[in-house]
């Protein structure tokens, strides 16, 4: 060992996404999502792992049900703390239908625009969280292809709660939400038994999102 060698004490930080990514979270806020607190808890746990800022990761949130609302744009907040405060305040907007294709398409066409803070040359990531089959499934194939054409990486999360509560088959639902996820599906698709279980996937989801910058 060289005589100039020094031991430096250091603490390994909690893994953070300190890279440049533009992330838009697309939240199903339709009537069947319950309890909503579980969704905001999931957001909190995911967002606090991110190093958010104009030169680091930016996050925007879109909520959909029978229509769509931009909760906040990519460039609205310039720190993790600010985003966490804003995310906690997001209220469930409800809706008579679950328009997943509309939510995704609005995120692609509007949330990922420079006017709303998207940065040129920065990787685009979409995280879609939903608890039911879409009523605009007939539009989904084209919408996903449009995302693919724009190199938007998609992580999709199926919440099986309302199906399990109603003792309904989840097969078609899971198939639909898998079709939303980027390839390879096994790395981009998640399903949870109910809304409360969302927090259990945060660590893995976070790691997979952060890994994108290395690809």
């Amino acid at each position: 060992v060289s005589p100039t060698f020094q031991v430096v004490n250091s603490i390994a930080p909690v893994q953070e996404c300190s890279t440049q990514l533009d992330i838009v979270i697309v939240l199903d806020g339709s009537n069947s999502i319950y309890p909503w607190d579980s969704v905001t808890a999931f957001l909190n746990d995911l967002l606090e792992r991110m190093d958010i800022g104009p030169k680091q990761t930016q996050v925007g949130i879109v909520q959909y049900g029978e229509n769509v609302t931009h909760e906040f744009n990519l460039n609205k907040y310039s720190s993790t703390e600010e985003v966490l405060v804003a995310a906690k305040k997001i209220v469930q907007r409800g809706g008579r239908q679950t328009m997943t294709a509309l939510g995704i398409d609005t995120a692609r066409k509007e949330a990922f625009t420079e006017a709303r803070g998207a940065r040129r040359g920065v990787k685009k990531v979409m995280v879609i969280v939903t608890d039911g089959e879409s009523h605009d499934n007939h539009r989904l194939k084209k919408v996903i292809q449009d995302c693919e054409d724009e190199n938007i990486q998609r992580f999709s999360i199926a919440i099986l709660g309302s199906y399990n509560r109603g003792n309904l088959s989840t097969e078609k639902f899971v198939e639909e939400i898998k079709s939303i996820a980027s390839e390879p599906t096994e790395k981009h698709f998640f399903n949870v038994s109910d809304e409360l279980a969302l927090v259990t996937i945060v660590k893995t989801l976070g790691e997979r999102i952060f890994a994108l910058e290395a690809t």
């Epitope: 029978e66 229509n67 008579r96 239908q97 328009m99 509309l102 039911g132 089959e133 879409s134 009523h135 605009d136 499934n137 007939h138 539009r139 989904l140 109603g166 309904l168 078609k172 639909e176």
Partner: antibody, heavy 120, light 107 residues
């Protein structure tokens, strides 16, 4: 390709019955809310009724002139929508269309239509 | 039930003209207002949804505007293939009523 194809139209006497079918393909039919719309000769479009998906109870709504006479149903295993028309009247003569229906997009997919003629 | 009215009921125009059709709902419809084009013997075709969104594949000369109860369809420069009947429809609450239609023919 997303497609709707109606069938079952024809000539029927007043008081008679007819069942129209609409075969769906290219999308997950079981998710969709579906409607029937009709158009009498030389007239405007008239919404007949809607059926929700089975997960929402498959509930139906109908327009006043057909209530109690027309019934909308669906068979998700066959990807088919039906319109059972009983006690037909001459004013039910029209081209009948099936459509995919959402609040946001309205009716963005239509079949080609099937003609129903009620005449003695 | 929500009543939909349209004006004019018919209009004559020439290729290149700017055409405006109005639609009024008897009560607020949360911008769930759609415009359809229909040609004789054919099924209606969605042009505009949610008051102002252009349906995929529809030329940009078609535009929709308005909110609350009053809505407008505009064709910025009429083309030969645009001669048809145009109908508005509310999709806010059943019954999903249509306007009576506006026939656009050649002057």
């Amino acid at each position: 390709e997303v497609q709707l194809v109606e069938s079952g139209g024809g000539l029927v006497k007043p008081g008679g019955s007819l069942r129209l079918s609409c075969a769906a393909s290219g999308f997950t039919f079981s998710n969709a809310w579906m409607s029937w719309v009709r158009q009498a000769p030389g007239k405007g479009l008239e919404w007949v009724g809607r059926i929700k998906s089975k997960t929402e109870g498959g509930t139906t709504d109908n327009v006043a002139p057909v209530k109690g006479r027309f019934t909308i149903s669906r068979d998700d295993s066959k990807n088919t929508l039906y319109l059972q028309m009983n006690s037909l009247k001459t004013e039910d003569t029209a081209v009948y269309y099936c459509t995919i229906t959402t609040h946001y997009y309205g009716m963005d997919v239509w079949g080609q239509g099937t003609t129903v003629t009620v005449s003695s | 039930d929500i009543q939909m009215t349209q004006s004019p009921s018919s209009l004559s125009a020439s290729v290149g003209d700017r055409v405006t059709i109005t639609c009024r709902a008897s009560q607020t419809i949360n911008n769930y207002l759609n415009w359809y084009q229909q040609k004789p013997g054919k099924a209606p075709k969605l042009l505009i949804y949610a008051a102002s969104s252009l349906q995929s594949g529809v030329p940009s000369r078609f535009s929709g505007s308005g909110s609350g109860t009053d809505f407008t369809l505009t064709i910025s420069s009429l083309q030969p293939e645009d001669f048809a009947t145009y109908s508005c429809q509310q999709s806010n609450s059943p019954p999903f009523t249509f306007g009576p239609g506006t026939k656009v023919d050649v002057k």
